[in-house]
Amino acid sequence: QGWQAFKNDATEIIPELGEYPEPPPELENNKTMNRAENGGRPPHHPFETKDVSEYSCRELHFTRYVTDGPCRSAKPVTELVCSGQCGPARLLPNAIGRGKWWRPSGPDFRCIPDRYRAQRVQLLCPGGEAPRARKVRLVASCKCKRLTRFHNQSELKDFGTEAARPQKGRKPRPRARSAKANQAELENAY
């Protein structure tokens, strides 16, 4: 039924409606940092350059369907995708000496989710299952955050919007059975 076209497991389905996973603690409590959507960066940055775009943390609105195994949300949800280069990065000569290349140096700032919101969605499932309500966690804002090398390994994996996120504490839903009868009528067998 074309499910894979909608597949994107970046949004986390919260296992129980009563549970609401807390976002990770702030990695840097810098109150003077500009709002992410304004393309801000930490002031007095040791590697500051005149090109603001190097440090922009953009909040891109992304509309898509939430999926949970073979199930798909009845309607698309709109959430934010964090994008952009927070820096700092140095422009260094490459090994051959023909031009420049970016290489991370010093503290590592990344544009990652800052706040989350919970939203209920209706999941539609094939194979004779009834639609059901689920609460999902969606990105509500982005921020340039200072990450240690340790955080690089954990935080960025957790927030990658391209990689499929493992569903913690959920058993995989069994695949829908194949239909046996005439397809035109069978679409109503659900």
């Epitope: 039924q1 409606l17 798909r72 949300s73 009845a74 309607k75 949800v77 939203q119 209920r120 969605v121 209706q122 539609l124 094939p126 194979g127 004779g128 299952e129 009834a130 639609p131 059901r132 309500a133 689920r134 059975r177 046996k180 009868a181 005439n182 009528e185 069978l186 679409e187 109503n188 067998a189 659900y190």
Partner: antibody
Framework: QVQLVESGGGLVQPGGSLRLSCAAS????????MNWVRQAPGKGLEWVSF????????YYADSVKGRFTISRDNSKNTLYLQMNSLRAEDTAVYYC?????????????????WGQGTLVTVSS | DIELTQPPSVSVAPGQTARISCSGD??????VHWYQQKPGQAPVLVIY???NRPSGIPERFSGSNSGNTATLTISGTQAEDEADYYC??????????VFGGRTKLTVL
Amino acid sequence: QVQLVESGGGLVQPGGSLRLSCAASGFTFSSYVMNWVRQAPGKGLEWVSFISGDSSNTYYADSVKGRFTISRDNSKNTLYLQMNSLRAEDTAVYYCARTFMHGHLGGGLSMDFWGQGTLVTVSS
Amino acid sequence: DIELTQPPSVSVAPGQTARISCSGDNIGSFYVHWYQQKPGQAPVLVIYDDNNRPSGIPERFSGSNSGNTATLTISGTQAEDEADYYCGSWAGSSGSYVFGGRTKLTVL
């Protein structure tokens, strides 16, 4: 045309059992999800149970879980609701309703045809 | 489960527009259906999937759904529209169907 006719209602004592039937005609019964919905006298609608076309999936309202069992016999075009351990609060008109899938993935699975209902009275 | 809340009654003059609301937590993300029930009769589906009319339902019936409120709108209300109306949706966390409370529409 689509027709749903419920039967099997009546007066039963608390703790007793009753089996409701819903005879379907005018459509390919096995291809449709079916539901039971009830309505207590003077009250609103309350969904009771759901069964998929091939009986592989059944769902129940919390208020009837463990006491009621939904089933179907596609060869007879008939839907059933076995009601055990009946209580006074189960007194209602019971409707069977066909559930139709609109568009991709069935949309919201609305109940597009209803029977006229059968009255179940639980009283001593 | 999400609770769907409807006003107990709505009154409208003939020819005017009647609006019946159905509110619930983020109900705009769910498909909502509307049923009409006249005294002594079985319910009839008048709107499915927020804003679609089944065949045989007059064009004066329409629906909308966004945010926390779904609305059934009856334009140019007629005396025969006097009935009880229910919104409904598969809004339970374990596959249950939820009906809103009854709204009695009175055509003055």
